[in-house]
């Protein structure tokens, strides 16, 4: 904490302008009156204050709104938002995208994840819901910032918004949040034909149930082994050789390549040897040929 | 323009780590494998392991397993390999390498970083 | 594991000259899962050829590959200054994934 001095009369500072980075840290703290420095927060990103001044400034507007920065404050915050903590940022309330893309514009290039993160969260609960605007705002000044929000946000997206959806957009979702927007991209893109869909709902998938997975092998889709892999663990187990097969279609060779990796290996041990032998690609690990399989969880369930 | 930027030189003691990166641009890092090649001075190419930076799932060469730790973040888009226990066998120039996912051949490499192992 | 040995080591030849550089591999390897790569001094490896006999974006056409099981080759029909290089095969289809010795081309 900075320590408490008195400020001298030739310092006393009327407004917020270049010549206080001539000041030292205690000066600052003594000089510059909080409420002045929230009036005239546009002013200060325009100045090339040093970081041990910014958290002087920071240090004011923490005393001077313990309970969380008004957004007329967010919002010019520039520079001045890298110095935020996300505990910080939790007490905000923020509803204005312009303050937003202000920030974001702000965090980039920067180690912000989780100030981001935080940050949108707190836009989305200020507007209520992820509505398309804020759905537009975000992949256009940070794409893959939709999949900071937790499963929870993103309950809140209405499907009509999932066509403004990019696949760089969701490149970060984890299966928790594609399970929550696979159902969602499905009803939205329920009218489309065969291949048009599989192209829309494909960065989707890590968030599909195996009877969906089932029903594109089916279909022709020749999925590549980057979309296979990223299906759910789940998914992909009760595959039967020839549906994977089918879900592939010449891209079935790639099993070979990825045999060791998650979800392709579970697969793989999964099935009989005699079935994988039908591919051809010289998989091993299978269930050998004349070996029952006793699935223990069942009979479990029913003593 | 697809590229793996990789960090500078680097000069370690023996039994020391190293934890290289390998930042990736133009392209989806979630769509292709990370893998990671060794060469010593003059000498050829040694495959030390693969990550799949969707899910962090990693596979590596026996000879380097326990030692080497394949890692991604996928907000910065920068794969990461650390190497532990360093002995002056370690000196050698590593590279990250994109491979898509399915096949077998790395069509962009890395920078390369060196890393001298010496007391 | 299983070992790709590379021959000549190094070599030089003429420009004008139809190279052949070969692959053997210790046991039979798909010929989907075999490339070629190119490397100059002081940079990183390029691309050069993919399972087996496709050209990589960017490669002259005078270059070509070819082989199956356990022998490979690439092939330049006429040699310039600048495929002066060391050429690595690169095997995929076992773990774990390895490469040749290399071989050192240079011009004459």
């Known amino acids: 904490d900075v320590e408490r001095t008195t400020c001298p009369p030739e310092k006393e500072v009327h407004e917020i302008d270049e010549s206080l980075i001539f000041y030292k840290k205690r000066e600052l703290e003594a000089c510059v009156d909080a409420a002045l420095l929230a009036a005239q927060m546009d002013r200060v990103d325009a100045i090339p204050f040093t970081y041990e001044q910014l958290d002087v400034l920071k240090h004011k507007l923490d005393e001077l709104y313990p309970q969380g920065y008004p957004e007329s404050v967010i919002r010019h915050l520039g520079h001045l938002f890298l110095k935020m903590s996300p505990e910080d940022i939790r007490k905000w309330n923020v509803t204005s995208l312009e303050t937003l893309k202000a920030l974001l514009k702000v965090s980039k290039g920067h180690e912000m994840s989780a100030q981001v993160a935080t940050l949108i969260d707190r836009v989305v609960v200020g507007r209520g819901q992820l509505d398309k605007d804020t759905v537009d705002t975000l992949t256009a000044f940070c794409p893959g910032c939709l999949c900071s929000l937790s499963p929870e946000r993103l309950s809140s997206v209405p499907p009509s918004v999932i066509g403004a959806v990019r696949p760089q957009d969701l490149d970060t979702c984890g299966p928790r949040q594609l399970d929550v927007l696979y159902p969602k991209a499905r009803l939205a893109f329920q009218n489309m034909s065969g291949s048009e869909y599989f192209v829309k709902i494909r960065p989707f998938l890590g968030g599909a149930p195996t009877e969906d997975v089932k029903a594109l092998s089916q279909q022709n889709v020749s999925m590549d082994l980057a979309t296979f892999m990223k299906l759910r663990r789940e998914a992909v187990l009760p595959l039967t050789v020839a549906e994977v097969q089918k879900l592939l279609g010449p891209h079935v060779e790639g099993l070979k390549v990825e045999e060791q990796h998650s979800p392709v290996r579970d697969w793989i041990l999964k099935q009989r040897q005699d079935d994988l032998d039908t591919l051809g690609l010289g998989l091993q690990g299978g269930i050998p040929n004349g070996y029952l399989i006793l699935d223990l969880s069942v009979r479990e369930a029913l003593s | 323009e697809v590229q793996l930027q990789q960090s500078g030189p680097e000069l370690v003691k023996p039994g020391a780590s190293v934890k290289i990166p390998c930042k990736a641009s133009?392209?989806?890092?979630?769509?292709?494998?990370m893998d990671w090649v060794k060469q010593s001075r003059g000498k050829s190419l040694e495959w030390i392991g693969d990550v799949f930076p969707y899910n962090g799932d990693s596979i590596y060469n026996q000879k380097f397993e326990g030692r080497a730790t394949l890692t991604v973040d996928k907000y910065s888009s920068t794969a990461y390999m650390e190497l532990r226990g360093l002995t002056s066998e370690d000196t050698a120039v590593y590279f990250c390498?994109?491979?898509?996912?399915?096949?077998?051949?790395?069509?962009?490499w890395g920078t390369g970083t060196t890393v001298t192992v010496s007391s | 594991q299983l070992v790709l040995t590379q021959s000549p080591a190094i070599m030089s030849a003429s420009p004008g000259e139809k190279v052949t550089l070969t692959c053997s591999a210790s046991?039979?390897?798909?010929?989907?899962?075999l490339s070629w790569y190119l490397q100059k001094p002081g940079s990183s490896p390029k691309l050069w050829i993919y399972?087996?006999?496709n050209l990589a974006s960017g490669v002259p056409a005078r270059f070509s590959g070819s082989g199956s099981g356990t022998s490979y080759s690439l092939t330049i029909s006429s040699m310039e200054a600048e495929d002066a290089a060391s050429y690595f095969c690169h095997q995929w289809s076992s773990y774990p994934y390895t490469f040749g010795g290399g071989t050192k081309l240079e011009i004459k």
């Open positions: 046991s039979s390897v798909s010929s989907t899962y």
């Open positions: 133009g392209y989806t890092i979630t769509d292709y494998n």
């Open positions: 399972s087996t006999s």
């Open positions: 390498a994109r491979r898509k996912t399915g096949t077998g051949y790395f069509d962009v």
